[in-house]
Every structure is written in C-alpha cells, then in structure tokens.
C-alpha cells in the first residue's frame, strides 16, 4: 500500500496526524461513516495536548469524537485502549441517561462547550472531527 506523507487539502496537520473539522452536523454513525470514506476515523484523543488542540479548533460547540459504548464497554474506533488511555469526562459523566425521552440511553461521546466529554444520544446531529495518521500505510488491499 501507499503511505500518506502530507495532509489532504482543508485538513490541519498536528503531531503527525491530520485533522478535519466539520462545520455541519450528523448523527454519530453517519459522521463515523464520513470519516471512514475519507480513509480516516473520528478523532481519538490520546493526550491532554491533543485535547487542547482539538478544543481550540472546535470552539464551544458539541462535537462527536470516536468513542462509543454501543456494544457494551467504551471503545475507541481505532482500537486504542479506553481503560488505560486519556479521559476528560465532565463530572458525573458518562451517565447513560435515559431521561431524554428519545428511547435508550446515551452511547456516544462528544466534546461539550467547555471541551470536557459527555455521553449523549448517538442520533443527535452534532459536528464531528476526522483524524488520520501520517506515515501510516493505507488500507489498500494487495493486488492479486
């Protein structure tokens, strides 16, 4: 496969990753799909430094990240270990709140207006951030 050595147009490079910030909203699954079609993934936050970088770019707006617990435990979309990794939840979150009246609980994580994380209904149309790593071999299958 080929390697990506620079970020695509309209993406922002930071610490050997490329980031794209939406200015419109989608449900979590549709945002996830959008990133994957760009050969990327919803942003995975692995450090306080990366948290501050993303927060600076999104401003005080609810924004999806690549973290969900739709199948039980919390999981990052790229396989990064949740239990041992960076976390920045708001106090008393995640709470899987059922009181919103939309059916079910809250299975998808987003940045809130102050940057800290909250779990929310995955169908809400929030903005999102895509991320892809530089110098990573693409997923192109080998020629047969």
């Amino acid at each position: 496969g080929s390697e990506r050595t620079c970020c695509p147009v309209n993406w922002v490079e930071h610490e050997r990753s490329c980031y794209w910030f939406s200015r419109s909203g989608k449900a979590w699954a549709d945002a996830d799909n959008y990133c994957r079609l760009e050969d990327a993934h919803l942003v995975v936050v692995t450090s306080w430094e990366e948290q501050k970088f993303v927060q600076h770019h999104i401003g005080p707006v609810n924004t999806w990240m690549g973290l969900h617990d739709q199948n039980g435990p919390w999981k990052w979309v790229d396989g990064t270990d949740y239990e041992t990794g960076f976390k920045n939840w708001r106090p008393e979150q995640p709470d899987d709140w059922y009181g919103h009246g939309l059916g079910g609980g809250e299975d998808c994580a987003h940045f809130t207006d102050d940057g800290r994380w909250n779990d929310d209904v995955c169908q809400r149309p929030y903005r999102w951030v895509c991320e892809t790593e530089l110098d990573k071999a693409s997923q192109e299958p080998p020629l047969l």
Partner: antibody, heavy 121, light 106 residues
Framework: EVQLLESGGGLVQPGGSLRLSCAAS????????MIWVRQAPGKGLEWVST????????YSADSVKGRFTISRDNSKNTLYLQMNSLRAEDTAVYYC??????????????WGQGTLVTVSS | DIQMTQSPSSLSASVGDRVIIPCRAS??????LNWYQQKPGKAPKLLIY???SLQSGVPSRFSGSGSGTDFTLTISSLQPEDFATYSC????????FGQGTRLDIN
C-alpha cells in the same frame, strides 16, 4: 477532462454472476471515494455501494449486501462491482460516479454513461 | 433509511416559464441535499449541491433552496434543453434519491 467509463454489463441468468468495471481518467483516482448507483427500467436512482479512496472501507445497500462486492485497483484507475446470486430485481442500468466531499456534505460528479445488466432466464 | 418524496412525478411547462420542483425528506437533513438532471438514455448530471450551491458550468437559471425537510429546485426561465427528469438526493445518512419529477413540454 474527468471521465468514467463503465463496462461488463449484459444478459445473465438468475443466480449468475457478473463483474462490472469503471475506468477512470483525468483525476487522481486514489484520492476519491467512488460509488455505484443503479436505475431499474422506468424507476428512480438507487445507491448500491461506496468505497473509500484506498479501498480500505466499503459499505453497501441492504438490498445487495452479501451478494455484491465493490472494489478498486488504484494502479489501474479502475473501480469494480462483483455481482453474485443475481436476481430479476437487479436488472438495471449501473452507473459509477466519483464522490466529492468538501464541506461535510457530499455529492457525485461526474457519472459514467452506464452499463445495462439484465437478469432473465 | 431517509425517504425522499418528489411530487408531482411529472410536470408540464412551456419555454420561458418559471418552474419550481419540490422535494421533501422524511426527516431533517439540514442542507445535505443535491439535485440531478437526467435525460432519456443518459447519465445523471449534477446541478445543485448542498441545497443551494450551483455546480460549475450549470446555467444560472437553475437555483436550489430549502433546509430541514423541504427543498425546491427552481428554473427561472425554462429553455428547450431543460426538459428532462430532475431527482433530489440526500447525503445526511445512507444516500437515497427521490423518484424524480419529469418535466414535459406543455
């Protein structure tokens, strides 16, 4: 000039297989996701399948899942649709198109001229 | 899936007429809407993307408007080459198309 040219359509019996190709030119093929859309005679357009620029991610309509496989060969600037277990209701003109995504929304441009697939005994 | 409804399925008009073609989504799709023109035996051609942005090379007599669930394609002064089928498409979620509105000569 950006161009897409489909081939591989034809008459096939129910349960049979066919592989469609879409040859691309005039743009950096590997930088764009690509799609297949079909149109049954006298009907509207129906999205079939999409593949990312690298080929690493695909997704398809429920109506073809498990039967149709989208793939691409970026070294040949070619998109494919492998169609197995064909049914009469798969009879349609099949179009390939380039997916353009800039602002979070997406659109399809240009489209190939289409290739007709007829499933009949 | 999100359903896209185009009614009427056909519309008659004359050259020079102002024509408005509606499209309705089964749920809020914000501005994730595109319009395509298709002539018999030909491939679809993109006219409008993101509800109101005119595709390069498309005549300015075409315009799109709307947001949420209700959208319109307007042709300000119908030309002979505009008689065709017009389809809307949403890309908020898994892509779906309307059934199309056929524009006929009156």
């Amino acid at each position: 000039e950006v161009q897409l040219l489909e081939s591989g359509g034809g008459l096939v019996q129910p349960g049979g297989s066919l592989r469609l190709s879409c040859a691309a030119s005039g743009f950096t093929f590997s930088s764009y996701a690509m799609i297949w859309v079909r149109q049954a005679p006298g009907k509207g357009l129906e999205w079939v399948s999409t593949i990312s620029g690298s080929g690493g991610y695909t997704y398809s309509a429920d109506s073809v899942k498990g039967r149709f496989t989208i793939s691409r060969d970026n070294s040949k600037n070619t998109l494919y649709l492998q169609m197995n277990s064909l049914r009469a209701e798969d009879t349609a003109v099949y179009y390939c198109a380039r997916r353009i995504a800039v602002t979070g929304t997406e659109w399809y441009d240009p489209w190939g001229q289409g290739t007709l697939v007829t499933v009949s005994s | 899936d999100i359903q896209m409804t185009q009614s009427p399925s056909s519309l008659s008009a004359s050259v020079g007429d102002r024509v408005i073609i509606p499209c309705r989504a089964s749920q809020n799709i914000s501005s994730y809407l595109n319009w395509y023109q298709q002539k018999p035996g030909k491939a679809p051609k993109l006219l409008i993307y993101a509800a109101s942005s005119l595709q390069s090379g498309v005549p300015s007599r075409f315009s799109g408007s709307g947001s949420g669930t209700d959208f319109t394609l307007t042709i300000s002064s119908l030309q002979p080459e505009d008689f065709a089928t017009y389809s809307c498409q949403q890309t908020y979620s898994t892509p779906t198309f309307g059934q199309g509105t056929r524009l006929d000569i009156n």
